[in-house]
């Protein structure tokens, strides 16, 4: 289990859509940093499909990778719960109608671990800031 | 599929600069690094350098410090790479490689056909 | 800078037999408990197309004769068995690190 105080909010479905869809621009960077640490022919194929999901103009924010291997495998799980967990609530949502509210209060608290705690600042933000 | 398109060969004089292009398709070009590398004839291969279409980010190997740079278009999803002050030692096939998406450098996994660059008077 | 050291330089083998190519590094290249080191196979006039990432991962459509392992220093690319579609020159690079680097090659001809 991850402290409280290590935890971060993906915002998994956005809350401004009837139904609701999924928040391709905060789950996307998550799948582009672990790309390297996974099978990088099946990420590429999630990341090109949540692109197609994604608005043009959305930001995204740059994500870094935990240095210690063991905190690295754990992230990398947590973001593959958390992303079948958010699909899972994406098919139920479009199952059952619009019960907007509730399957919104559920997932939008679905945590993860902040990959960029605990990191030298030059390991984090910009890709080019790596060396 | 995954191409990587690269401009024709050029022969150019010593001294004079020149730039290659490198168009990609078959993905999302903002995501992933461009990697160029450089293969002289009957020789090895030797990395020049990487930009990031996202945020235009850039490292070089020092060898091509002020011998190579690095730009995109994100536009028309093309990558490009002027050498300047040719000189002969900078006759060698050129190519254009996609990397990874993320700060941790990954594997170049589709290559271009390459760019013949010939110096000569 | 991380020098790879590939061997042997050329290499010749029997169809059907088994090639094995080293590549040492002056330095690990393993990180996050994975090994950045990468192989490709390239043929004359062609570009180089990648064979196994990451040490021992099999890319995309190369077929299972194909294989890679090691880890920190010592990584081995092995062919078995070899087919004639298979003399080429083949390269290590590693990623752990820029610049990266890549091994002078290992030239694979048929005996």
């Known amino acids: 289990m991850v402290p409280e105080s290590n935890r971060t909010l993906l915002l998994c479905l956005t809350s401004d859509s009837q139904p609701p869809r999924l928040n391709s621009s905060a789950i996307l960077p998550y799948f582009r940093a672990i790309r390297p640490l996974s099978d990088k022919n099946i990420i590429d194929k999630i990341i090109e499909q949540l692109d197609k999901l994604k608005f043009q103009h959305e930001p995204e924010t740059e994500i870094s990778v935990p240095a210690d291997t063991f905190e690295c495998k754990s992230f990398i799980l947590t973001i593959l719960q958390q992303f079948s967990a958010c699909l899972e609530s994406v098919f139920k949502s479009l199952n059952s109608g619009p019960q907007k509210g509730e399957l919104n209060s559920k997932l939008e608290g679905k945590p993860i671990p902040n990959p960029l705690l605990g990191l030298d600042s030059t390991r984090t933000g910009h890709h080019h800031h790596h060396h | 599929q995954v191409q990587l398109q690269q401009s024709g060969a050029e022969l150019v004089k010593p001294g004079a600069s020149v730039k290659l292009s490198c168009k990609a398709s078959?993905?999302?070009?903002?995501?992933?690094?461009i990697n160029w590398v450089r293969q002289r004839p009957e020789q090895g291969l030797e990395w020049i350098g990487w930009?990031?279409?996202?945020?235009?980010?850039?490292k070089y190997n020092e060898t091509f410090k002020g011998k190579a740079t690095l730009t995109t278009d994100k536009s028309s999803s093309t990558a490009y790479m002027q050498l300047s002050r040719l000189t002969s030692e900078d006759s060698a096939v050129y190519f254009c490689?996609?990397?990874?998406?993320?700060?941790?450098?990954?594997?170049?996994?589709?290559w271009g056909q390459g760019t013949s660059v010939t110096v000569s008077s | 800078d991380i020098v790879l050291t590939q061997s042997p330089a050329s290499l010749a083998v029997s169809l059907g037999q088994r090639a094995t190519i080293s590549c040492r590094a002056s330095e690990s290249v393993d990180n996050y408990g994975i090994s950045f080191m990468h192989w490709y196979q390239q043929k004359p006039g062609q570009p180089p197309k990648l064979l196994i990432y990451?040490?021992?991962n099999l890319e995309s459509g190369i077929p299972a004769r194909f294989s890679g392992s090691g880890s920190r220093t010592d990584f081995t690319l092995t062919i078995n068995p070899v087919e004639t579609d298979d003399v080429a020159t083949y390269y290590c690079q590693q990623s752990n690190k820029d610049p990266l680097t890549f091994g002078a090659g290992t030239k694979l001809e048929l005996k």
């Open positions: 490689a996609r990397g990874g998406t993320s700060v941790i450098r990954d594997a170049m996994d589709y």
């Open positions: 990451r040490a021992s």
């Open positions: 930009i990031f279409p996202g945020d235009g980010g850039t």
């Open positions: 078959g993905y999302t070009f903002k995501y992933y690094d």
